[in-house]
């Protein structure tokens, strides 16, 4: 999944309801799996920010070696730096672990730009601010990498939380979360609350800032407002979902919904941006430009290159439209919509501005591998990865950045027919199977 702007490579609503509103379903909360309610020990266990990823503290080996690990729902390997690297403050030292077992097998993961390679083994792993368990998990010990680790990011490895189908070198390598569920009584569910800064942070502030929460084994009610709406996981490889409609400030992009999911749509905490297929991106930008036409911005801004700066505190949020994605619902012909604000899709960038300036990058970008709902989307919502029931839940995040006029929203239900037709069926040739968005 590390294509384009994958992190390790670096980067009140208008609009009529769609058709008739359906009657409210029975409250979904009685049906949720896993432990309910409070997970105090896991709240605020993530640090970081959207531009460099969100990481959780983990320990590996015996005695335990503490590392910060990027939380990535767009890949399926647990991989950690295991050799000195200029950007790493620390790394996994296998020779110091009495519980390390060598699998005598290498792994090589190339990206569009960059790569990592390493040696496979297993060791004991735990999450200090997570469930009170220790599991034996597969670990890729990264011995060589290029454009993978990020200078100053403060993480030393990656926790791939997606399914075995996209694990490297092949799907026989059990991902960490599968091992966790198999070896413990922890329910097969986790949830993420990523809290974007909303304003530029200097390096001191960034290191001290709380980034959010990864709740393992359930849902924490304190992390969201309103109700959770669920969309089916279409296929268990990436966390693939189906988008059925896209609106900019309530205006339908009016595209064949297959275009929105060409060649897939995934939820990926390891990607910074909201990435859209070329045709969709072009239509969306045209619509966003039209909605914000009282100002004109350079082409480089819409390409995610140039930064637009305003005097501190004067960012004109109101001129930028909201973006709504309608997702397939759990009930036939029913959808719901998630709506993000410019506070999510204009990403604050530190270092370039003076203290008197607020500078932003446009964090919607073009993709050749389908829609990627990255941190830009996730920072608006509490996202539940309900693997047990093959569904992903969205609710308004208690920590999302907004203003006094608009807030991110999750709303439904809406009547939407023929949603199954919105999914793109990737041709299953030998070649395409080998190339699932990796090389």
């Amino acid at each position: 999944t590390h294509l384009g702007i994958r992190l390790p490579l670096r980067s009140g609503l208008a609009g009529p309801p769609l058709g008739l509103r359906l009657p409210r379903e029975t409250d979904e909360e009685s049906e949720e799996p896993g432990r309910r309610g409070s997970f105090v020990e896991m709240v605020d266990n993530l640090r970081g920010k959207s531009g460099q990823g969100y990481y959780v503290e983990m320990t590996v080996g015996s005695p335990p070696q503490t590392l910060n690990i990027l939380v990535d729902t767009g890949s399926s390997n647990f991989a950690v730096g295991a050799a000195p690297h200029p950007f790493l403050h620390r790394y996994y030292q296998r020779q110091l672990s009495s519980t390390y077992r060598d699998l005598r097998k290498g792994v090589y993961v190339p990206y569009t730009q960059g790569k990592w390679e390493g040696e496979l083994g297993t060791d004991l792993v735990s999450i200090p601010h997570g469930p009170n368990v220790t599991v034996r998990a597969n670990i890729a010990a990264i011995t060589e990498s290029d454009k993978f680790f990020i200078n100053g990011s403060n993480w030393e490895g990656i926790l791939g939380l997606a399914y075995a189908e996209i694990a490297r070198p092949d799907d026989s390598l059990e991902p960490f979360f599968d091992s966790l569920v198999k070896q413990t009584h922890i329910p097969n569910i986790f949830s993420l609350q990523l809290c974007g800064a909303g304003f530029p942070l200097n390096q001191t502030e960034a290191l001290a800032s709380v980034g959010g929460s990864m709740i393992i084994g359930g849902i924490d009610h304190s992390l969201y407002t309103g109700r959770l709406w669920y969309t089916p996981i279409r296929r268990e490889w990436y966390y693939e979902v189906i988008i059925v409609r896209v609106e900019i400030n309530g205006q339908d992009l009016k595209m064949d919904c297959k275009e929105y999911n060409y060649d897939k749509s995934i939820v990926d905490s390891g990607t910074t941006n909201l990435r859209l297929p070329k045709k969709v991106f072009e239509a969306a930008v045209k619509s966003i430009k039209a909605a914000s036409s009282t100002e004109k911005f350079p082409d480089g801004f819409w390409l995610g290159e140039q930064l637009v700066c305003w005097q501190a505190g004067t960012t004109p949020w109101n001129i930028f439209p909201v973006i709504s994605l309608y997702l397939m619902g759990e009930v036939t012909n029913q959808s719901f919509r998630i709506t993000i604000l410019p506070q999510q899709y204009l990403r604050p960038v530190e270092d370039v501005a003076t203290s008197q300036d607020d500078c932003y990058k446009f964090a919607v970008s073009q993709s050749s591998t389908g829609t990627v709902m990255g941190a830009v989307i996730m920072e608006g919502f509490y996202v539940v990865f309900d693997r047990a029931r093959k569904r992903i839940g969205f609710a308004v995040s208690a920590c999302h950045v907004h203003d006094e006029f608009r807030t991110a929203a999750v709303e439904g239900p809406f009547v939407t027919a023929d949603m199954e037709d919105c999914g793109y069926n990737i041709p299953q040739t030998d070649e395409s199977t080998l190339m699932t968005g990796r090389a």
């Epitope: 036409s293 100002e295 480089g300 801004f301 140039q306 270092d351 370039v352 500078c359």
Partner: antibody, heavy 120, light 108 residues
Framework: QLQLQESGPGLVKPSETLSLTCTVS??????????WGWIRQPPGKGLEWIGS???????YYNPSFKSRVTISVDTSKNQFSLKLSSVTAADTAVYYC????????????WGRGTLVTVSS | EIVLTQSPATLSLSPGERATLSCRAS??????LAWYQQKPGQAPRLLIY???NRATGIPARFSGSGSGTDFTLTISSLEPEDFAVYYC??????????FGGGTKVEIK
């Protein structure tokens, strides 16, 4: 051919407001393709951006001027203006108006400039 | 804040010689960099934009190169009218705002 011409008093007293106008000929301030900007150059020194304006009246200012600067546009007269309040001797400079073109990222056409001296 | 540092401050050359002017950014500005020429008593004139594109009417002896943090303006063979002050300007941060301190090209 598009031309820009600055006009306004060459001498302003300290604490008063400096007011300059840029008249655009051979083109239009209502074009959607350009911003319009003011840059100044103190004697013997480098260039300093003051601010820019779009046809809609949307403005961007150099934060170092804080709240002293106001730029406005009058598309009916094909003019845009600069007001800089509470001036001091440090504001003595040649003031240029310019068109922001080439993807609204560079100053591609400039006026000839006008020297404004702040002195009592 | 992105700072542009130009070097040398002064370049003393003779007509017909090759001039190489440097502009270094304190952090990457991609290719969002321009060069201007300013003759005494005149307004600046845009020479190069987006690091390497010549503006309308600019002679071919002027060329720009570089990306990221290091940029070069080259005048392949100095003409008498080329003796002037040259400024670089970045527009990675928009609106365009930051100029370098200038390099004076004078007759040796």
């Amino acid at each position: 051919q598009l031309q820009l011409q600055e006009s306004g008093p060459g001498l302003v007293k300290p604490s008063e407001t400096l007011s300059l106008t840029c008249t655009v000929s051979g083109g239009s301030t209502s074009s959607s393709s350009y911003y319009w900007g003011w840059i100044r150059q103190p004697p013997g020194k480098g260039l300093e951006w003051i601010g820019s304006i779009y046809r809609s009246g949307s403005t961007y200012y150099n934060p170092s001027f804080k709240s002293r600067v106001t730029i406005s546009v009058d598309t009916s007269k094909n003019q845009f203006s600069l007001k800089l309040s509470s001036v001091t001797a440090a504001d003595t400079a040649v003031y240029y108006c310019a068109r922001v073109g080439h993807g609204i990222s560079y100053f591609d056409l400039w006026g000839r400039g006008t020297l404004v001296t702040v002195s009592s | 804040e992105i700072v542009l540092t130009q070097s040398p401050a002064t370049l003393s050359l003779s007509p017909g010689e090759r001039a190489t002017l440097s502009c270094r950014a304190s952090q990457s500005v991609s290719s969002y960099l321009a060069w201007y020429q300013q003759k005494p008593g005149q307004a600046p004139r845009l020479l190069i934009y987006d690091a390497s594109n010549r503006a309308t009417g600019i002679p071919a002896r002027f060329s720009g190169s570089g990306s990221g943090t290091d940029f070069t303006l080259t005048i392949s063979s100095l003409e008498p009218e080329d003796f002037a002050v040259y400024y670089c300007q970045q527009s990675l941060t928009w609106p365009p705002r930051t100029f370098g301190g200038g390099t004076k090209v004078e007759i040796k």
